[in-house]
Amino acid sequence: ARNGDRCPLGPGRCCRLHTVHASLEDLGWADWVLSPREVQVTMCIGACPSQFREANMHAQIKMNLHRLKPDTVPAPCCVPASYNPMVLIQKTDTGVSLQTYDDLLAKDCHCV
Amino acid sequence: ARNGDRCPLGPGRCCRLHTVHASLEDLGWADWVLSPREVQVTMCIGACPSQFREANMHAQIKMNLHRLKPDTVPAPCCVPASYNPMVLIQKTDTGVSLQTYDDLLAKDCHCV
C-alpha cells in the first residue's frame, strides 16, 4: 500500500516543514518593518520522490513525466499547502500600522 | 522599476507554462483511462530568479534566505498558480464513466 508520508530517502530528507531563524536584515525588511525583529520562518524544504505527499493529479503526472524525460521535466517541488498568518508592525509615511499577512509562514507542505 | 514578468536569464529560461505531449502509457494511465489517448500536458517549468513572478510574501522571504543560505534554503520553485479542468473517459468495473479533474493541467505559473 502506498504511503504518501513515508520518506523512502530516509528520515527528514523528504518534503517537510522546516524552521529558519531570520533577522529583519536577513529578510530584507529592516527598512519597512519594526516588529518582530526576528522571525521563525516556517518553510517547505526537501525532496519529492514518487508518491510522497503528492498534492494532486498534476503532481502525479509531473513525476511520471520526470521519470521519462528528466532533462525536460523537473521533479515535483516541495511547496506550502497552506499558510499561517502573521502580524507585522510596519513603518508608514506617518508612523506605524499593524498589517496581517496571510501568506507569510508555511503551515504544511506538499509536492506539486 | 521591478518587472515580475521580465526574465533576467534570457527568453524562455524563467518559470512559465510549457506543453509536454504525453501518451496514456507515459502518464501511467493506460490501465484506467480510455480517452484521451494522448494529452497535451501543460506544466510549469523554469527558473525562479529574484522578484520573478513571486506568488506571495513567502516567496520573497524564501528568495532572500536562499541568497543568504543557499545550502540550507532552496530557491523558490515554479508551480501552477491555477489549473484548467479536463475530462477523462475512464474505465470502471461495469464500463466507462466521465470524470472531470480540476487539478490536472496547469493554467498559469508562479514562483513559490
Epitope: 519594526l34 516588529s35 518582530p36 499561517n84 498568518p85 502573521m86 502580524v87 507585522l88 508592525i89 506605524v96 499593524l98 496581517t100 507569510l104 509562514l105 | -
Partner: antibody
Framework: QVQLQESGPGLVKPSETLSLTCTFS??????????VGWIRQPPGKGLEWLAH???????RYNPALKSRLTISKDTSKSQISLKLSSVTAADTAVYYC??????????WGQGTTVTVSS | DIQMTQSPSSLSASVGDRVTITCKAS??????VAWYQQKPGQSPKALIY???YRYSGVPSRFSGSGSGTDFTLTISSLQPEDFATYYC????????FGQGTRLEIK
Amino acid sequence: QVQLQESGPGLVKPSETLSLTCTFSGFSLSTSGMGVGWIRQPPGKGLEWLAHIRWDDVKRYNPALKSRLTISKDTSKSQISLKLSSVTAADTAVYYCAQMAWDWFAYWGQGTTVTVSS
Amino acid sequence: DIQMTQSPSSLSASVGDRVTITCKASQNVDTDVAWYQQKPGQSPKALIYSASYRYSGVPSRFSGSGSGTDFTLTISSLQPEDFATYYCHQYNSYPTFGQGTRLEIK
C-alpha cells in the same frame, strides 16, 4: 475593526476568586505575533500589567501577582479568561484587556469595574 | 523589574503650548517604549510605538524620542482634546508603566 469587551462579576467578596472574560473580534489569536493582555487600574491610580497570552500559547504573568493569576484562551470562541485568586480590597480596579501586537498594547477594551467588598 | 519614572506627575498648560513629558527607565530598554493617552472615563489609546513612531491615525503634533533610559513625548501645539493623562510603557522586559502625567488646562 478591532473590538475587545471585558466582562466580570462587578462585585467580589474578599478571599474569593475573580473571573474575568475578554471577548474580542477583528483579529485572530491564531495569527503569529498576536496576543491579548490584561491591565488594571485602581481608582485614581496608574496602570498595572497583570498577564498576557500569545498566539503560541506562551503565558506571561506579573511576578508580584504570579501565584494568584491564571490566564487561558479559547481561540475558537475568541475569548481570553483571567482568574485572580484570594482577592482583597487592593484588587478593586478597572480591568482592561488589550490586543497585543508582539509586545505592544495596540488597542484596548473599555474596561470592567471590579469592587472587592464583603 | 524595570521602573518607569515619569515627570512631571501633573502639568498645567494652555491651548497652543508646546509640552514635553519625560520618562526615565531604571535600566536600558533600547527603544522598546510606547506612549498612551487616557481621557477620564475612557480606556487608554496608543499614541507612540518603539519610542518615536506614531500609531496610525495619531495627529502629527504628537512625537516621541529617546533610547536607552531617557524618553520624551512632545505635543507641539496643544489642542483642547489633548488634555488627558499620558503613560509611558516599556516592553523590553515584562511590561511596566510609568505612573502617569496629568495634563490640565491652565
